[in-house]
């Protein structure tokens, strides 16, 4: 806390400008009006304030808005956002995607901080669902964002938003998350033709059931081994050798390199040796 002291004569701030960088902390506290600061927040980022000075500015805003900052202030916080705690952010009501983008920009290039996680949580909860524009924005800043959500949170993603998802956005998703996302993707892409459909659905197939894999095996899709390795073990086990051969097409030879790894190992173990021998890969059940 900065001690309350009277502002020295002639030092009262008329606007937020570079002259303030020469003010001591107590002078900032005494001479900068909180309401002025709030209306001119957009100027703060252009001024090279020290961390200590930013602490004072934050303190002034906290006093002015004890129930939480209005969005007009939040949108222009800039680097002052880095001074906010998750507890501060929980008081906010952020509804504008532009505000969200502005604050994410401040943290760009860094891992998702607790502050950013809280901000996103508040924003998404306020919207009621993870719409396409929000998902586009979040995955642009944090490619792993989608996979950081719980299956329960993912259930609020409407199928229409799935169009915004890129393959790399799903890299770190686990089976429980893909179990939720796959049916949404299937719904979103249902009107596409065979080859186009496979291109779009491929990265979601870690949530596909056996019957869908069997159907794909009849469509000459030539699934690559990287995709096959991400399939659910329980979905792969019932596939016959012939079905796996059709599913993988020319990539079937890659099974040999993966024979010690799941789910290939689990599948091999449950096949008849005679059937495996038809592949000519030397796989041992």
């Amino acid at each position: 806390e900065v001690e309350k002291t009277a502002c020295p004569s002639g030092k009262k701030a008329r606007e937020i400008d570079e002259s303030l960088i020469f003010y001591k902390k107590w002078e900032l506290e005494a001479c900068v009006d909180a309401a002025l600061l709030a209306t001119q927040m957009d100027r703060v980022n252009a001024i090279p304030f020290t961390y200590e000075q930013l602490d004072v500015l934050k303190h002034k805003l906290d006093e002015l808005y004890p129930q939480g900052y209005p969005e007009s202030v939040i949108q222009h916080l800039g680097y002052l956002f880095l001074k906010m705690s998750p507890e501060d952010i929980r008081k906010w009501n952020v509804t504008s995607l532009e505000t969200l983008k502005a604050l994410l920009e401040v943290n760009k290039g860094h891992e998702m901080s607790p502050q950013v996680a809280t901000l996103i949580d508040r924003f998404v909860k306020g919207r009621g669902q993870l719409d396409k524009d929000t998902l586009d924005t979040l995955t642009a800043f944090y490619p792993g964002y989608l996979c950081s959500l719980s299956p329960e949170e993912l259930s609020s993603v409407p199928p229409s938003s799935i169009w915004a998802v890129r393959p790399q956005d799903l890299d770190t998703c686990d089976p429980r998350q893909l179990d939720v996302l796959y049916p949404k993707a299937r719904l979103a892409f249902q009107n596409m033709n065979g080859s186009e459909y496979f291109v779009k659905i491929q990265s979601f197939l870690g949530g596909a059931p056996t019957e869908d894999l069997k159907a794909l095996s009849q469509q000459n899709v030539s699934m690559d081994l990287a995709t096959f390795m991400k399939l659910r073990t329980d979905a792969v086990l019932p596939l016959t050798v012939a079905e796996v051969q059709k599913l993988l097409g020319p990539h079937v030879e890659g099974l040999k390199a993966e024979e010690r790894h799941r789910p290939v190992r689990d599948w091999i173990l449950r096949q008849r040796q005679d059937d495996l021998d038809t592949l000519g890969l030397g796989l041992q059940g």
Partner: antibody
Amino acid sequence: QVQLQESGPGLVKPSETLSLTCTVSGGSVSSYHDLWSWIRQPPGKGLEWIGYIYYSGSTNYNPSLKSRVTISVDTSKNQFSLKLSSVTAADTAVYYCARDFVLSGFDIWGQGTMVTVSS
Amino acid sequence: DIQMTQSPSSLSASVGDRVTITCRASQSSRYYVNWYQQKPGKAPKLLIYAASSLQSGVPSRFSGSGSGTDFTLTISSLQPEDFATYYCQQSYDASYTFGGGTKVEIK
């Protein structure tokens, strides 16, 4: 409810073969989804996987023990067994049998049996 | 073989504390990592499978996360019955391997 029970001698002489059997009750050793493993734990130390068997007879062993280990299955008795040859004092441990359910992990364990290698 | 390195090897904590144990694989194990709890003189008990799935009957204060090479077991609020040794295990490669264990002791 599947239960596992290890049995076998608690004392084995150096250079001899350690033999243990695990009896499966409340379920079948021929289950499609299950592998049957042996795991050991030397006194005061961590867990070491020895190997597994599928009801078809397919096996897989820890490379560090492979030359000395044989795991077999007897579907008629609903049992699987471990043989570890040329034992030394370093093989003294609690030996556990466990079910490896394909969709999870070692979800059911025997209570363990202490085997001491000493002359 | 995939080596599993657990840290810390031991920790002291109080009832109600949030406890985090990490496990690092020497190469990718995808999400095929399980966590076990073992109490003295007892067989291990499966807590978490496939990195983040809670085994049936295990309290929800236990959670797992991670994929690839880095995995975490978290106990959100430590209870008296949670003082035990915890092990991670990978089953991605055919040669299963366990971490060295983390002993959680009372502070």
